[in-house]
């Protein structure tokens, strides 16, 4: 999906209002210095591309993020503010259904969510730079 035509201001507002709080809740008990951020993003479409991939693509070390509250809200936000996004997400929905039902938060999932927080923060910063 090409995120170029999204309403970035509306996505920022949704992130600051709800998604960020859910991510921080997920990370509760860990320090920001516990994990080294190894990925970043260049501009707003790039940030959303990587956020979407990291949130919804199960990885061998962390298969369950797609079922978390922040992931559901991310999906709703992208569907709302990115034209045509919903139609591209049939595969992602299947991935969510296949994701483990276990609610165990592994260290690797915490690390992945730490990376996500970094990508979202970069998204906000690139937005501020453009204004």
């Amino acid at each position: 999906y090409d995120f170029t035509n999204c309403d970035f201001q509306k996505i920022e507002a949704d992130y600051l209002r709800t998604i960020s709080k859910d991510l921080i809740t997920y990370m509760s008990g860990t320090k920001s210095t516990d994990f080294n951020n190894t990925v970043s993003c260049s501009n707003r479409p790039h940030c959303l591309t990587e956020i979407q991939s990291l949130t919804f693509n199960p990885t061998p070390r962390c298969a369950s993020l797609a079922k978390e509250m922040f992931a559901r809200k991310t999906k709703a936000t992208l569907a709302l503010w990115c034209p045509g996004y919903s139609e591209t997400q049939i595969n992602a929905t299947q991935a969510m259904k296949k994701a483990r039902k276990s609610k165990v938060t592994t260290n690797k999932c915490l690390e992945q969510v730490s990376q996500l927080l970094g990508l979202w923060r970069r998204f906000i910063r690139t937005l501020l730079k453009k204004q």
Epitope: N36, N37, T38, V39, S40, C41, S42, N43, P45, H46, T49, E50, S53, L54, N57, T59, P60, R61, Q112, Q115, K129
Partner: antibody, heavy 117, light 108 residues
């Protein structure tokens, strides 16, 4: 200390597919970062080809997108480049590199691929 | 596509002298710029990222400055091992990351 090592044929015929592999040691490619390919024609500058991230997202240089495929094999801790329909203009030293999806902090030593019949 | 123009193409200096290399972008890249050093037969090495942050293990004599469209790499006092080709790279314009054409720093 991460180390990267390119391998593959040094000579490819025009119109065929160039295939290279980058073996990574000292770091798991499924643990973090992105894993990128960059090339440098003899005596010329650098051109970014694309990357695959540790979680599987892939991004390509638009000028090469129609001909490029980057994939990975996490069990062997390596990633690969395929470039189809090559011409003499694809003759270059091909580097693999670790990236944070922005810039490139560790590089392989490079492998020269010549396109010639 | 953002075009990066490096100048001069060649810089002839003696060890101990100060080197000032320029990289100009065809449009603003904010501070999304990196510098690399490449010696003959070797891979490039990251020197500077985010326009002014030194990469791990890079000596303090290397410094980067600039924002927007004009950037400078300064080598405060050239060591014999610093004679090489230097490239700038912008990462503001995903998915079209581009490099400059390079500046060769040679011994006078």
């Amino acid at each position: 200390q991460v180390q990267l090592q390119e391998s593959g044929p040094g000579l490819v015929k025009p119109s065929e597919t160039l295939s290279l592999t980058c073996a990574v040691s000292g770091y798991s490619i499924s643990s973090g970062y992105g894993w990128s390919w960059i090339r440098q024609p003899p005596g010329k500058g650098l051109e970014w080809i694309g990357y695959i991230s540790y979680y599987g997202s892939i991004s390509y240089n638009p000028s090469l997108k129609s001909r490029v495929t980057i994939s990975r094999d996490t069990s062997k801790n390596q990633f690969s480049l395929k470039l189809s329909s090559v011409t003499a203009a694809d003759t270059a030293v091909y580097y693999c590199a670790r990236t944070n999806l922005l810039y490139f902090d560790s590089w392989g030593q490079g492998t020269l691929v010549t396109v010639s019949s | 596509e953002i075009v990066l123009t490096q100048s001069p193409a060649t810089l002839s200096l003696s060890p101990g002298e100060r080197a000032t290399l320029s990289c100009r972008a065809s449009q603003s890249v904010s501070n999304n710029l990196a510098w690399y050093q490449q010696k003959p037969g070797q891979a490039p090495r990251l020197l500077i990222y985010d326009a002014s942050s030194r990469a791990t293990g890079i000596p303090a004599r290397f410094s980067g400055s600039g924002s927007g469209t004009d950037f400078t790499l300064t080598i405060s006092s050239l060591e014999p091992e610093d004679f090489a080709v230097y490239y700038c790279q912008q990462y503001s314009d995903w998915p079209q990351y581009t490099f400059g054409q390079g500046t060769k720093v040679e011994i006078k």
